[in-house]
């Protein structure tokens, strides 16, 4: 589209500078040497080339590096990154966190594009694991990044990286993802004292097993209802009324408002009505007095 035979007299670019923004697309194509462009990539981002002009500059780099750009060029792409396709990015080998940061900065404030997703994928695969510095960087730019990973991908996150995770980074995680992250968080925060530990582990509790919830109930943690509602139903069901009361502390009154929703609804069905009545909240639906509760799952396990 922008191919032209010759550069007009006197327009040959000797360096990449501001004068080039006044060139038409075909003039850029004809008058800018690809090797000059590659060696002076650091200047490109300082010059406000338009989106169309960037097309031409990309075309020149593509011709110079058909197998993929070297990192020395990639780290200075700046706004030119917006022109890259996932196919282009799959040819790259990005190893420097500074390069990653520079490219994410260009996309700042936008949703994660397919280009950015591909870039991150290439970077993380190149590193072999999602280390703390990388996770720090990615969640700073994309708070929902962790929850976009599969449980398999999350399994490569080392416990030390969990320190970089903020509560909002887990907002969109599903139970399968929290199942993977919770044990890592437990390991990462194991040396903290009770109240500090709870503050850190709270966002991960959607992956906690029953025995850990029982342990927390002994520590006066006063879990809020929002956290309780995100707990695994199978982890909540075995808790006694007394344990839930201790776990929630003053927030126990909130159970009434949630009695029709999981996991509260399912938990109520498993409790003796007598025990529920001790809470004084008017929770209904427990096992009537005098009924015998058989734990069939235990019977199956024994046979």
């Amino acid at each position: 589209e922008v191919e032209k035979t010759a550069c007009p007299s006197g327009k040959k670019a000797r360096e990449i500078d501001e004068s080039l923004i006044f060139y038409k697309k075909w003039e850029l194509e004809a008058c800018v040497d690809a090797a000059l462009l590659a060696t002076q990539m650091d200047r490109v981002n300082a010059i406000p080339f338009t989106y169309e002009q960037l097309d031409v500059l990309k075309h020149k780099l593509d011709e110079l590096y058909p197998q993929g750009y070297p990192e020395s060029v990639i780290q200075h792409l700046g706004y030119l990154f917006l022109k890259m396709s996932p196919e282009d990015i799959r040819k790259w080998n990005v190893t420097s966190l500074e390069t990653l940061k520079a490219l994410l900065e260009v996309n700042k404030g936008h949703e994660m594009s397919p280009q950015v997703a591909t870039l991150i994928d290439r970077f993380v695969k190149g590193r072999g694991q999602l280390d703390k510095d990388t996770l720090d960087t990615l969640t700073a730019f994309y708070p929902g990044y962790l929850c976009s990973l599969s449980p398999e991908e999350l399994s490569s996150v080392p416990p030390s990286s969990i320190w970089a995770v903020r509560p909002q980074d887990l907002d969109t995680c599903d139970p399968r993802q929290l199942d993977v992250l919770y044990p890592k968080a437990r390991l990462a925060f194991q040396n903290m004292n009770g109240s500090e530990y709870f503050v850190k582990i709270q966002s991960f509790l959607g992956g906690a097993p029953t025995e850990d919830l029982k342990a927390l109930s002994q520590q006066n943690v006063s879990m809020d209802l929002a956290t309780f509602m995100k707990l695994r139903t199978d982890a909540v069901l075995p808790l006694t009324v007394a344990e839930v009361q201790k776990l929630l502390g003053p927030h126990v009154e909130g159970l009434k408002a949630e009695e029709r929703h999981r996991p509260v609804r399912d938990w109520i069905l498993r409790q003796r009505q007598d025990d529920l009545d001790t809470l004084g909240l008017g929770l209904q639906g427990g096992i009537p007095n005098g009924y015998l509760v058989l734990d069939l799952s235990m019977q199956e396990a024994l046979s």
């Epitope: 589209e1 922008v2 032209k4 923004i21 006044f22 060139y23 038409k24 697309k25 075909w26 003039e27 850029l28 406000p48 338009t50 989106y51 169309e52 002009q53 706004y79 404030g109 936008h110």
Partner: antibody, heavy 118, light 107 residues
Framework: EVQLQQSGAELVKPGASVKLSCTAS????????MHWVKQRTEQGLEWIGR????????KYAPKFQGKATITADTSSNTAYLQLSSLTSEDTAVYYC???????????WGQGTSVTVSS | DIVMTQSQKFMSTSVGDRVSITCKAS??????VGWYQQKPGQSPKALIY???NRHTGVPDRFTGSGSGTDFTLTISNVQSEDLADYFC?????????FGGGTKLVIK
């Protein structure tokens, strides 16, 4: 002095077509992009599209694709805007403007008023 | 399309005052913004290109600033001949788009 001289006012019937011209003096249109802009009474400016007279390459705003056709004749140093299937919505003043590679519009014609009425 | 918003439709000022007209882009347009003046019954005239550069012949009381998404045209020592509509234009990506305009009214 750089000047863009546009053709005179047009009164046309609905469904018809019209072709407006814009002739440059004191510069060669091949060295610039030539843009066309629409302005309806008491309303803002809308970019219709542009042409590179050097090679005839055009770019249009999606809204005007199919409605507008921009051409250029370098021998007469003139750019043209053709509007087809005219309706009352096309009643407006149309400006041509010249600009460099940045896409900015540096010099403007005096405008051509197009009135679509039966 | 990139939307250019000029939130003030009218601005009232007095001769000798300083006035700032703003324009906000819906996404980053770097410095690819121009400012245009249109006096009643006339065609637009380019004042500022690439956000902060004055066109030839434009008085130095007109100053442009900004980059990214926020842009300002400042007229210091306003003169009666500055009564006009002022439009911003983004030419970072096509379709190029104009702001809705700000009419400067002299008290």
């Amino acid at each position: 002095e750089v000047q863009l001289q546009q053709s005179g006012a047009e009164l046309v019937k609905p469904g018809a077509s019209v072709k407006l011209s814009c002739t440059a003096s004191a510069f060669n249109i091949k060295d610039y992009y030539m843009h066309w802009v629409k302005q309806r009474t008491e309303q803002g400016l809308e970019w219709i599209g542009r042409i590179d007279p050097e090679d005839g390459e055009t770019k249009y705003a999606p809204k005007f694709q199919g409605k507008a056709t921009i051409t250029a004749d370098t021998s007469s140093n003139t750019a043209y805007l053709q509007l087809s299937s005219l309706t009352s919505e096309d009643t407006a003043v149309y400006y041509c403007a010249s600009g460099s590679g940045t896409g900015a519009m540096d010099y403007w014609g005096q405008g051509t008023s197009v009135t679509v009425s039966s | 399309d990139i939307v250019m918003t000029q939130s003030q439709k009218f601005m009232s000022t007095s001769v000798g005052d300083r006035v700032s007209i703003t324009c906000k882009a819906s996404q980053n347009v770097r410095t690819a913004v121009g400012w245009y003046q249109q006096k009643p019954g006339q065609s637009p005239k380019a004042l500022i290109y690439l956000a902060s550069n004055r066109h030839t012949g434009v008085p130095d009381r007109f100053t442009g600033s900004g980059s990214g998404t926020d842009f300002t045209l400042t007229i210091s020592n306003v003169q009666s001949e500055d009564l006009a509509d002022y439009f911003c234009l983004q030419h970072w990506n096509s379709p190029y788009t104009f702001g809705g305009g700000t009419k400067l009214v002299i008290k």
